[in-house]
Interface confidence: medium
């Protein structure tokens, strides 16, 4: 398997309850405005093939995606959250910026893709989506890159 | 097939120490984050503890944190429980449980049959 | 993080349909969609039956379903068979990173 690097996260950036529980309180807000409920953007899908070790590389790649293409455009809606919750993910993604695959990433790349396909299919609901799993995600990061 | 075999149980005095142990088989055991749920004699569930895919984070119920650890070993497929200060009130059938998909522990799909904690003087 | 409400016991005959409530808190049921439903039959481990709310896992029959309002999951079963009585339990996954369970409903067949 592909050996990753520097993909870590220090235990701290978790252990925050007051963003802890913004995050998840914007992840709420949108995820009432969120009308689709059988589709599910990070789930079983998102990870198949894909081991533990390898795990935090692919949320990276999530997590950059769902800063740039969602949550930049969207920064103006779900106030307060938003303002307090994009600086906070961004900087998860700065410490994640060394974090690479050393090796074939294809079958990550292709869960991504697919990911971002359906955010881009399901237009601005697919964007409210993305959001409304932001607990997922946050989630997900905690799970694969402590 | 997935199986999952808990062991370690047993009788012990208020005060005292016990380990448990989960052996796991069928299924890659660094994938998944892992459980242990709990569940006293006509009573129902009660999660008890928590880790992830490499140890990297524990979390625990509150009735247990500070007295129980939990810990894996990846090479050997297993996952521990390490219980001290035991009372009356951890008196239980301790079941292993697994992730239904490796990316959420919290659904646990897969169970082990239980091994009994009796605390008792 | 205290227990889910459920209530104790549920019952029903067979071809109907019943709905067993989970009412949790703000911190767990209400704000996040990590609720799952187990059952278990008496001397057995439990059987996860749906989780996140209203999915369900491979070789779960499609008679069971999970729905979610406000702070409130429900699981219902349609078509009710004699092999569904048995003891049920929601649970949610919060923003503590603990899980909490509810305290059990006991289905009846009648």
């Known amino acids: 398997a592909p050996i990753s690097s520097h993909c870590r996260l220090d235990k701290s950036n978790f252990q925050q309850p007051y963003i802890t529980n913004r995050t998840f309180m914007l992840a709420k807000e949108a995820s009432l405005a969120d009308n689709n409920t059988d589709v599910r953007l990070i789930g079983e899908k998102l990870f198949h093939g894909v081991s533990m070790s390898e795990r935090c590389y692919l949320m990276k790649q999530v997590l950059n995606f769902t800063l740039e293409e969602v949550l930049f455009p969207q920064s103006d809606r779900f106030q307060p959250y938003m303002q307090e919750v994009v600086p906070f993910l961004a900087r998860l993604s700065n410490r994640l910026s060394t974090c690479h695959i050393e090796g074939d990433d294809l079958h990550i790349q292709r869960n991504v893709q697919k990911l971002k396909d359906t955010v881009k299919k399901l237009g601005e609901s697919g964007e409210i989506k993305a959001i409304g799993e932001l607990d997922l995600l946050f989630m997900s990061l905690r799970n694969a890159c402590i | 097939e997935v199986q999952l075999v808990e062991s370690g149980g047993g009788v012990v005095r208020p005060g005292g120490s016990l380990r448990l142990s989960c052996a796991a088989s069928g299924f890659t055991f660094d994938d998944y984050g892992m459980n242990w749920v709990r569940q006293a004699p006509g009573k129902g569930l009660e999660w008890v503890s928590g880790v992830n895919w490499n140890g990297g984070t524990r979390d625990y119920a509150a009735s247990v944190k500070g007295r129980f650890t939990i810990s894996r070993d990846n090479a050997k497929n297993s996952l521990y429980l390490q219980m001290n200060s035991l009372r009356a009130e951890d008196t239980a059938l301790y079941h292993c449980?697994?992730?239904?998909?490796?990316?959420?522990?919290?659904?646990?799909?897969?169970w082990g049959r239980g091994t009994l904690v009796t605390v008792s003087s | 993080q205290a227990a889910l409400t459920q209530p104790a016991s549920v019952s029903g005959s067979p071809g109907q349909s019943i709905t067993i409530s989970c009412t949790g808190a703000s911190g767990d049921v209400g704000a996040y969609n990590f609720v799952s439903w187990y059952q278990q039959h008496p001397g057995k481990a439990p059987k996860l039956i749906i989780y996140d709310v209203n999915k369900r896992p491979s070789g779960v029959s499609n008679r069971f379903s999970g729905s979610k309002s406000g702070n409130t999951a429900s699981l219902t079963i349609s078509g009710l068979q004699a092999e569904d009585e048995a003891d049920y339990y929601c649970s949610s996954y919060t923003s503590t990173f603990s899980v909490v369970f509810g305290g059990g409903t006991k289905l009846t067949v009648l």
């Open positions: 449980a697994r992730g239904w998909y490796s990316g959420a522990a919290w659904n646990m799909g897969y």
